[in-house]
Interface confidence: medium
C-alpha cells in the first residue's frame, strides 16, 4: 500500500513567494517620474519577477517632524491621488500581486515615530489601518519599530485590527536590530507578525557563521513562519560584495519562510556606482540612460534591460529562483535540515512528504572547496541519495540537469548549488 500523504499546511499568499519593496517611488521609476500612475506601468515587470507582494511607500502626507502635518489617510499629491492608488490596486489584483502599504508615520523626519507623541501617532495608525483595509490593501508595513515605545503592545493591537478584517491580511514590522533576543521579544506577543530585521546583515563572513545564524533563528522561532532579508529596507549591496549576491539570492529563496527584497536587489543595484545617489534609495537602472548624471557610468550589464537579455545574469537567476520557490512544494512549505558539509560551506535539505526534494550547498569562501556532506547529521526522513541532479549553479559553466555525485561535490569560490532528487520510500 502507498504511504499516506502528509496533510498540506494552510498557506497564506505571502507563504508562496517573495515580497518586493519599493520604498521610494521616484527612485524606482527614475527619469523625473515617480508616481502611482507610473508604477502601474511597471506591474508587468513585477509579474516577470514572480513576486507575490509589493511593499509600497510610505506615500502618505508627511511634513518632516510635524505630527499635525502628517496624515496617514492622505496620499502625498507628489505621488498621485486616491484614484491613482485605487487604479494601481485593481491592476495589481488582476496580475495576482498583493499590495502592502508602508505606514511608517514620519518617514521624512528624524524619528520615524515622533518620539514625544506616541499615543497620538498610534491612534493615527489605528485609523489608517481601518481606512486602508476598507480601500482594499492586502497588508501593512511599519518600520523602525525600535523607535516606537511599547512596540509589542501596539503591534499586537494593529495585528488584531488587520487579522480582524481578514486572516488574509498581513502586518510586517521592520527593525534595525540584529539582536536575536530583541527580535524574539517582538515576535513573542505577535503570532502572525512578519518581522524584517538586520539579523543576517553580518552573515557574509563564513558559511559556518551563516549556518549558525540561520539555525539559531529557526530553532528559536520554532514552527512560526519567518521572513528572510538582510535589513528592513536597504539593498543587498549595502551589506554584500558583488561576488556574494548570487549566493544570497539562492539562500534567501530556499530558506523556509518569505524572502523579502528591495527594488534593485534582482539586478545587484549598487548606490556606490552612482555618485550622489542615496545609499538607501538609488535610482533604479532600467537601461543605460537611467542615471544621466554621469554618462557611461552605467553599462548594459548593470541594467534591467541588459540583464533581461542575458540568461547568465543575476536578474535571470532571480527569476528562475522565484519561479522555483513559488511552485515546488518542498520549497513552499517543506521541512528544513541543515547539516555539515565542511569548513566554509553551508548546506541544507528542503523536503516535503513524497515530493521532489532539494539540496542547497553554499560556498561563502573565496577558494574552491570539496564538500564533505555529512549525511549522518540528517534524520531518516531526509536522507541523501548518492547522486542528485543539478537544477542550477550560481556560477556559469556547469551543465544543468546533469547528475552530480554528492561524495565528489566540488564548489567554486562563492558558488551555490541547487540540486534536486526524488523521494525514495
Amino acid at each position: 500500500r502507498a504511504p499516506r500523504c502528509r496533510e498540506l499546511p494552510a498557506q497564506k499568499w505571502w507563504h508562496t513567494g517573495a515580497l518586493y519593496r519599493i520604498g521610494d517611488l521616484q527612485a524606482f521609476q527614475g527619469h523625473g517620474a515617480g508616481n502611482l500612475a507610473g508604477l502601474k506601468g511597471r506591474l508587468d515587470y513585477l509579474s516577470s519577477l514572480k513576486v507575490k507582494g509589493l511593499v509600497l511607500g510610505p506615500i502618505h502626507k508627511n511634513q518632516k517632524d510635524d505630527v499635525a502635518q502628517t496624515d496617514l489617510l492622505q496620499i502625498d499629491p507628489n505621488f498621485g491621488s486616491k484614484e491613482d492608488f485605487d487604479s494601481l490596486l485593481q491592476s495589481a489584483k488582476k496580475k495576482s500581486i498583493r499590495v502592502i502599504l508602508d505606514l511608517t508615520p514620519n518617514y521624512r523626519g528624524e524619528n520615524s515615530w515622533f518620539s514625544t507623541q506616541v499615543d497620538t501617532v498610534a491612534t493615527k495608525v489605528k485609523d489608517a489601518l481601518e481606512f486602508w483595509l476598507q480601500a482594499g490593501v492586502d497588508g501593512f508595513q511599519v518600520r523602525d519599530i525600535e523607535n516606537l515605545k511599547d512596540a509589542s503592545s501596539f503591534l499586537a493591537e494593529w495585528q488584531n485590527i488587520t487579522k480582524g478584517f481578514s486572516e488574509d491580511r498581513l502586518l510586517i514590522a521592520g527593525t534595525n536590530s540584529s539582536d536575536l533576543q530583541q527580535i524574539l521579544s517582538l515576535l513573542e506577543s505577535n503570532k502572525d507578525l512578519l518581522l524584517t530585521s538586520s539579523y543576517l546583515s553580518d552573515s557574509g563572513s563564513t558559511g559556518e557563521h551563516t549556518k549558525s545564524l540561520v539555525t539559531q533563528y529557526l530553532n528559536a522561532t520554532g514552527n512560526r513562519w519567518c521572513s528572510w532579508s538582510l535589513s528592513q529596507a536597504r539593498l543587498l549591496t549595502s551589506f554584500l560584495p558583488a561576488q556574494l549576491l548570487r549566493l544570497y539570492q539562492l539562500m534567501l529563496f530556499t530558506l523556509p519562510g518569505t524572502p523579502v527584497f528591495s527594488y534593485g536587489d534582482e539586478i545587484g543595484l549598487d548606490a556606490a556606482a552612482l555618485p550622489g545617489q542615496p545609499m538607501e534609495a538609488p535610482v533604479m537602472l532600467w537601461d543605460e540612460s537611467s542615471f544621466p548624471d554621469i554618462p557611461g557610468a552605467v553599462s548594459a550589464n548593470m541594467t534591467v534591460k541588459g540583464q533581461s537579455e542575458d540568461p547568465g545574469s543575476l536578474l535571470s537567476l532571480f527569476r528562475r529562483l522565484s519561479d522555483q520557490r513559488s511552485k515546488e512544494r518542498s520549497l513552499l512549505h517543506g521541512d528544513f535540515h541543515a547539516f555539515s558539509a565542511g569548513p566554509g560551506l553551508f548546506s541544507y535539505i528542503r523536503h516535503w512528504d513524497q515530493n521532489e526534494r532539494f539540496l542547497v550547498v553554499l560556498n561563502f569562501g573565496d577558494v574552491g572547496l570539496s564538500a564533505g556532506l555529512q549525511a549522518s547529521d540528517l534524520p531518516a526522513s531526509a536522507s541523501l541519495p548518492a547522486k542528485a541532479d543539478l537544477l542550477l549553479s550560481t556560477q556559469p559553466g556547469r551543465e544543468e540537469g546533469s547528475p552530480l555525485e554528492l561524495e565528489r561535490l566540488k564548489l567554486e569560490p562563492h558558488e551555490g548549488l541547487l540540486l534536486r532528487f526524488p523521494y525514495a520510500a
Epitope: 555618485p275 554621469i294 557610468a297
Partner: antibody, heavy 119, light 113 residues
C-alpha cells in the same frame, strides 16, 4: 556652434549679493545639465554645483562651500543659466565659469566673469 | 571631500620630449560595479578657459591629439604627453567625479624650458 557667455560680474561688498547670468546658444538648452565652476586669482578650479535637465526635473546639487548662499536656476524660455550669490565673502572673489556638462566632466566652458568681493 | 594632489607643481619641458604629470586621490576612484575610474584631465592655456582632455581616466575627448594619454587606477593616475609641442603649455588639472562635491587637483604648470 555651442556658445556660453557669462555676465554680471563686478565689485561687491562683503555680505552683498550678485546675480550672474550665462547666455547660451547652439544647442537645445532644456536637454542639458549646466554647471558653475570658479577660479580664485592664481588658484585652481572649484566646482560649485549644477542644475539638471528637463528630464530630471531641473533639480540641483551644490558644493558644501556655497550651499545655502548660492542658488543655481535657469530660464528655459530664454536659454539662460543663473547663479544667485548671497552673503558674499572675500574668499568668493574669483572668475566664475558656466559650463555645459556631460555632466560629471565639463566639455564646454564660457569665457568667465570676474567677481571681486572687497570693502 | 576627496582631496586631489598633483605633482609636480611646475614642469619645465623641452619640445619634442615626453612629459608626465601625476595625480593622487585621497580615496579610490575605481568603482567595482563597472570597473571604471571616475577621473578627468583638463588643460587651461594662458588667458583661456579650461578644456577637457580625458575622462574615465583614459578616454580621450574628441579632437584631443593622440599625444595625450591618461592611465592609472584606484588612487594613482598619470597624464602623459608623448612629445610636447609649444601649444601644450598651460596648467593641467585632474578632477574626480566619484562623489559630490566634484573636486580638482591644485594644478601642474607646464612651461617650455
Amino acid at each position: 556652434e555651442v556658445q556660453l557667455v557669462e555676465s554680471g560680474g563686478g565689485l561687491v561688498k562683503p555680505g552683498g549679493s550678485l546675480r550672474l547670468s550665462c547666455a547660451t546658444s547652439g544647442f537645445t538648452f532644456i536637454d542639458y545639465y549646466m554647471s558653475w565652476v570658479r577660479q580664485a586669482p592664481g588658484k585652481g578650479l572649484e566646482w560649485l554645483g549644477f542644475i539638471r535637465n528637463k528630464a530630471n526635473r531641473y533639480t540641483t546639487e551644490y558644493s558644501a562651500s556655497v550651499k545655502g548662499r548660492f542658488t543655481i536656476s535657469r530660464d528655459n524660455s530664454k536659454s539662460i543659466l543663473y547663479l544667485q550669490m548671497n552673503s558674499l565673502k572675500t574668499e568668493d572673489t574669483a572668475v566664475y565659469y558656466c559650463t555645459r556638462d556631460r555632466p560629471a566632466w565639463f566639455v564646454y566652458w564660457g569665457q568667465g566673469t570676474l567677481v571681486t568681493v572687497s570693502s | 571631500d576627496i582631496v586631489m594632489t598633483q605633482t609636480p607643481l611646475s614642469l619645465p619641458v623641452t619640445p619634442g620630449e615626453p612629459a608626465s604629470i601625476s595625480c593622487k586621490s585621497s580615496q579610490s576612484l575605481l568603482y567595482s560595479s563597472n570597473q571604471k575610474n571616475y577621473l578627468a584631465w583638463y588643460l587651461q592655456k594662458p588667458g583661456q578657459s579650461p578644456q577637457l582632455l580625458i575622462y574615465w581616466a583614459s578616454t580621450r575627448e574628441s579632437g584631443v591629439p593622440d599625444r595625450f594619454s591618461g592611465s592609472g587606477s584606484g588612487t594613482d593616475f598619470t597624464l602623459k604627453i608623448s612629445r610636447v609641442e609649444a601649444e601644450d603649455v598651460g596648467v593641467y588639472y585632474c578632477q574626480q567625479y566619484y562623489s559630490y562635491p566634484y573636486t580638482f587637483g591644485g594644478g601642474t604648470k607646464v612651461e617650455i624650458k
